[in-house]
């Protein structure tokens, strides 16, 4: 806490400028008017204040706004934002996306700070849902943001927001998260034509059910093996050899290299060997000719 001392004659700051970097902490406290600071916050970032001096400036704003800073001040905090505590930020009411962007920029390229984490939570809660523009902004700074939400939290994401999602934003999502996101993506992209639809939906297919994979197999999509390997095993198992062949198109040859890996391995076990042989890939492990095909849903439990 800086002691209250009178400002020396002639040192009263008429504006926020570079001359203030030569002020001692007590002089800043005594000679800088808090209201002036609030209206000229945008200048603070251009001045190389020390951390100690920034502490004084923060203290002045805290005194001026004990209930929390107004958004006009928050938007121009810049590096002073890093001096804020999560408790400070919980007092704020940030509604502008521009304010959010300005503050995220301060922390850009670094792991999420406690300040940023609190800010984002406050902002999203204030909006009521994760709308497209907010998601667009958050994933631009934090590509893994979507995958850091629980399936329950993802369920409140409106389908319209899915348009903001890029393939790399889903890189770290687990299958349960994709289970929630896929139906939203399907709804969001439903009016697109076949090839455009596949480009958009491809990243979400880890949550697709069998019937949707069957439908895709009729559309000449030529799914690559990397995408196929991320499909739900339970969704792949009921597909016929002909359907997988149509789904993969020219990429079907890649099945041989993946025959020991899920879901290909489990799918092979469900197919008649005769049908697998029609692919001409030398896939082995199918049901021998003449054997009765029973429901193999217990296969997983027995393996």
């Amino acid at each position: 806490e800086v002691e209250k001392t009178a400002c020396p004659s002639g040192k009263k700051a008429p504006e926020i400028d570079e001359s203030l970097i030569f002020y001692k902490k007590w002089e800043l406290e005594a000679c800088v008017d808090a209201a002036l600071l609030a209206t000229q916050m945008d200048r603070v970032n251009a001045i190389p204040f020390t951390y100690e001096q920034l502490d004084v400036l923060k203290h002045k704003l805290d005194e001026l706004y004990p209930q929390g800073y107004p958004e006009s001040v928050i938007q121009h905090l810049g590096y002073l934002f890093l001096k804020m505590s999560p408790e400070d930020i919980r007092k704020w009411n940030v509604t502008s996306l521009e304010t959010l962007k300005a503050l995220l920029e301060v922390n850009k390229g670094h792991e999420m700070s406690p300040q940023v984490a609190t800010l984002i939570d406050r902002f999203v809660k204030g909006r009521g849902q994760l709308d497209k523009d907010t998601l667009d902004t958050l994933t631009a700074f934090y590509p893994g943001y979507l995958c850091s939400l629980s399936p329950e939290e993802l369920s409140s994401v409106p389908p319209s927001s899915i348009w903001a999602v890029r393939p790399q934003d889903l890189d770290t999502c687990d299958p349960r998260q994709l289970d929630v996101l896929y139906p939203k993506a399907r709804l969001a992209f439903q009016n697109m034509n076949g090839s455009e639809y596949f480009v958009k939906i491809q990243s979400f297919l880890g949550g697709a059910p069998t019937e949707d994979l069957k439908a895709l197999s009729q559309q000449n999509v030529s799914m690559d093996l990397a995408t196929f390997m991320k499909l739900r095993t339970d969704a792949v198992l009921p597909l016929t050899v002909a359907e997988v062949q149509k789904l993969l198109g020219p990429h079907v040859e890649g099945l041989k290299a993946e025959e020991r890996h899920r879901p290909v391995r489990d799918w092979i076990l469900r197919q008649r060997q005769d049908d697998l042989d029609t692919l001409g890939l030398g896939l082995q492990g199918g049901i021998p000719n003449g054997y009765l095909v029973l429901d193999l849903s217990m296969q997983e439990a027995l393996s």
């Epitope: 792991e111 999420m112 893994g144 943001y145 850091s148 629980s150 329950e152 770290t172």
Partner: nanobody, 115 residues
Amino acid sequence: QVQLVESGGGLVQAGGSLRLSCAASGSTFGRIVMRWYRQAQGKQREWVASIYDSGSTSYSDPVQGRFTISRDNARNTVYLQMNSLRPADTAVYYCNLGTALSSYWGQGTQVTVSS
């Protein structure tokens, strides 16, 4: 920088139990998802279970009902309780910490289930 260290792996008879631990060091803030993956010899790495920032959990079909993921925030540790183990559970088990920006991996711990 975040570091993850797994422990608790070993050799166990089919039907037995093991408890894996993953201790995280380094500072992370914001939402964190802790996940377990496993990789059997010559196979691809596969997801096993997740525990989200909210505390909710999810599991892959092969382990549902047998494995339980939990965490101790005070100790910065996540656990995987594995019951009714099967030979098919034999693999190197990896701990993963996912933040909104990065994904961190441990070195893995070997679990071998003999019949």
